[in-house]
């Protein structure tokens, strides 16, 4: 689009005539205040479209925006529009007239607004005042638009001086309404109740002055209405609450309770639902699996955890070997049961610096007047392995034996390995594993004993070496789930008179 003259702002003389031309590759039209004033449209031989708007006998009331736009923007790539602003300084016109609705400015949030008082002359000085005040407010003024800023709920007027007379605009009224996008929250005193107990639900709306509540609930569908109570939370402004109270709940009252809230200013609405379960009687239910065999490592702390659901709140007891456990004054045992949601509980038994004596049969029992549940498991104390003895001997048979003894829980696994190159082993060369097969030059004999009192296994393994022809580094490695330990001995041939 090409506009002549291009603007974007023109100052024209009162009573004069002025011609505006707009041309484009498609039909074009001039618009003024959303209307199409009389204009001459034409199409040139080269296919260019134009429109000529002739402004005659101009007055201050011709001040304002003029737009040139495509007559039919459908099918065009861009919805192009050229804007021109014309001032016609006219001492007989003070402020340009406003429509009645422009004088009332409603706000629903803190945002910048414009008080649209405009004059015909861009040279005039315009000031903004509260209606009952003389002091000019420090708000920026745009001659084409008015005063823009963030305004309080007040009445405002604009002032200017034309010649030697002071001119006032109409009063503009700014109103801020407390309306927000509705945000509803619904909660219940309890979402699980036994029959005969009360159901009480609350629906709260924040940030609105006028709202309407509507509840839907299982009883309503069967025609049994309950009257909700609505109140304002005085200590919290713009908090409105609706309470639905159903005394002596029945099984049929189980279901979805919905609070629908509407507000008429912006026609916003929101609803939230909550499920209520009415049970015939209370319950206790275990959640998740807890293995019947649990492990703890000696001298480390261990927390044993049981998760369950219950209503009403249960009593929780822990037992070891059928004796009731309690928090110990020495801080060796700690018991806690936490309510992690309305009906979900986590009960924990913490053993601090576990001792062998704490192995045994543990039971957690959760109960109330309607139901009970119990869970039992065996606690095994894992003891890291340690090699207690590694010794070499020369029996009369001529073979050489190495004996390794160690303990641990669970049962240790024993690995024998050897290094023949003492210079490079064990720094450079990994040891060679020794087995118990027929072609080996060694034989193994391993015995395992379980010591009840210490609750651990003892492993004794004897390695028989058929013929040792040069010094040999023999290692006994014991390993179990919680550790490993190694000892090493140098075995020398019978013929050598010394041991390394």
């Amino acid at each position: 689009l090409v506009v002549t003259p291009p603007g974007p702002e023109l100052v024209l003389n009162v009573s004069s005539t002025f011609v505006l031309t707009c041309s484009g590759s498609a039909p074009v039209v001039w618009e003024r205040m959303s209307q199409e004033p009389p204009q001459e449209m034409a199409k040139a031989q080269d296919g260019t479209f134009s429109s000529v708007l002739t402004l005659t006998n101009l007055t201050g009331l011709d001040t304002g925006e003029y737009f040139c736009t495509h007559n039919d923007s459908r099918g065009l790539e861009t919805d192009e529009r050229k804007r021109l602003y014309i001032f016609v300084p006219d001492p007989t016109v003070g402020f340009l007239p406003n429509d009645a609705e422009e004088l009332f400015i409603f706000l629903t949030e803190i945002t910048e607004i414009t008080i649209p008082c405009r004059v015909t002359d861009p040279q005039l000085v315009v000031t903004l005042h509260e209606k009952k005040g003389d002091v000019a407010l420090p708000v920026p003024y745009d001659h084409q638009r008015g005063f823009s800023g963030i305004f309080e709920d007040r009445s405002y007027i604009c002032k200017t001086t034309i010649g030697d007379r002071e001119v006032d605009s109409d009063a503009y009224y700014v109103y801020r309404l407390q309306v927000s996008s509705i945000n509803v929250s619904v909660n219940a005193v309890q979402t699980v109740v036994r029959q005969g107990e009360n159901i009480t639900l609350m629906c709260i709306v924040i940030g609105n002055e006028v709202v309407n509540f509507e509840w839907t609930y299982p009883r309503k569908e069967s025609g049994r209405l309950v009257e909700p109570v609505t109140d304002f939370l005085l200590d919290m402004p713009y908090h409105i609450r609706s309470i639905l109270h159903i005394p002596s709940a029945e099984l049929e009252d189980s279901g979805t309770y919905t609070c629908n809230v509407t507000e008429s200013v912006n026609d916003h609405q929101d609803e939230k639902a909550i499920n209520i379960t009415v049970v015939e009687s209370g319950y206790v239910r275990l959640l998740g699996e807890v293995g019947t065999l649990q492990f703890a490592e000696l001298h480390r702390s261990r927390t044993l955890q049981v998760v369950f659901e219950a209503y009403p709140p249960p009593t929780v007891l822990w037992f070891k070997d059928n004796r009731t456990l309690g928090d110990s004054s020495a801080g060796e045992i700690a018991l806690s049961t936490r309510n992690v949601s309305e009906t979900r509980y986590v009960s924990e038994l913490t053993l601090v610096r576990v001792k062998v004596a704490e192995a045994g049969h543990y039971t957690m029992r959760a109960f109330h007047e309607d139901a009970e549940v119990q869970l039992s498991f065996q606690l095994q104390i894992n003891v890291p392995v340690r090699v207690l003895e590694l010794s070499e001997s020369h029996p009369d048979s001529g073979e050489q034996t190495v004996r390794c003894r160690g303990r641990g829980m669970p049962q240790p696994n024993i690995i024998w390995s050897a290094c023949r190159d003492l210079k490079r082993c064990p720094r450079e060369l990994p040891p060679t594993l020794l087995g118990n097969s027929s072609e080996e030059e060694s034989q193994l004999e391993t015995n395992v004993t379980y010591w009840e009192e210490e609750q651990e296994f003892e492993v004794v393994s004897t390695l028989r070496l058929q013929h040792v022809d040069r010094p040999l580094s023999v290692r006994c490695t014991l390993r179990n789930a919680v550790g490993q330990d190694t000892q090493e001995v140098i075995v020398v041939p019978h013929s050598l008179p010394f041991k390394v």
Epitope: T432, L433, G435
Partner: antibody, heavy 118, light 106 residues
Framework: EVQLVESGGGVVQPGRSLRLSCAAS????????MHWVRQAPGKGLEWVTV????????YYADSVKGRFTISRDNSKNRLYLQMNSLRAEDTAVYYC???????????WGQGTMVTVSS | DIQMTQSPSTLSASVGDRLTITCRAS??????LAWYQQKPGKAPTLLIY???SLESGVPSRFSGSGSGTDFTLTISSLQPDDFATYYC????????FGQGTKLEIK
């Protein structure tokens, strides 16, 4: 879930260095010896290096001795392989694997590709 | 160093077949031998350790035998999921793998 996850692979020029990392979870890392095994494209498995559970012993294949260094940080459950003076023949997928003395490699990572190319 | 030699290098078979892969050590390794399965683009997984012990979670159609220098991996009834490359490994002295046996669909 017992898991090993390697990272740090990439494309590197001959003679340059690269450090691989292996994050262990789901088991007591400090209880186990750890290995690096590699596999050149279209080829078989080649054992590279091992480190004892407590870091006391480290062993290397002759092909990488003096150039590669294995290490571990038991507090972070991490295994590392520092690869220096890289050669084209080091191009491979590198796996970390769990394997104690006297045990096969029962847990493997998904592997990380190292490409040595100019 | 102990060398491990697998045979055959490639093996074609059909679902339901019984097949054997062999592995030979250059010196006695007692029963310190493991078998692994590897599928394209994946890490190896342990099938058999200590020559004949089945790793937990591995189907019972896999079995291992042998001691000293000669070892075999047997699949009693081949399943579609078994087509892969198989490696033996000794861990008596250091750690070495066989060159692999690729099992293909006939």
């Amino acid at each position: 879930e017992v898991q090993l996850v390697e990272s740090g692979g990439g494309v590197v020029q001959p003679g340059r260095s690269l450090r691989l990392s292996c994050a262990a979870s789901g088991f007591t890392f400090s209880n186990y010896g750890m290995h690096w095994v590699r596999q050149a494209p279209g080829k078989g498995l080649e054992w590279v290096t091992v480190i004892w559970y407590d870091g006391s012993y480290k062993y290397y294949a002759d092909s990488v001795k003096g150039r590669f260094t294995i290490s571990r940080d038991n507090s972070k459950n991490r295994l590392y392989l520092q690869m220096n003076s890289l050669r084209a023949e080091d191009t491979a997928v590198y796996y970390c694997a769990r394997g104690e003395l006297g045990d096969a490699f029962d847990i493997w990572g998904q592997g990380t590709m190292v490409t040595v190319s100019s | 160093d102990i060398q491990m030699t697998q045979s055959p290098s490639t093996l074609s078979a059909s679902v339901g077949d019984r097949l054997t892969i062999t592995c030979r050590a250059s010196q006695s390794i007692s029963t310190w031998l493991a078998w692994y399965q590897q599928k394209p683009g994946k890490a190896p997984t342990l099938l058999i350790y200590k020559a004949s012990s089945l790793e937990s979670g591995v189907p019972s159609r896999f079995s291992g035998s042998g001691s000293g220098t000669d070892f075999t991996l047997t699949i009693s009834s081949l399943q579609p999921d078994d087509f892969a490359t198989y490696y033996c490994q000794q861990y008596k002295t250091s750690w070495t793998f066989g060159q692999g046996t690729k099992l293909e669909i006939k």
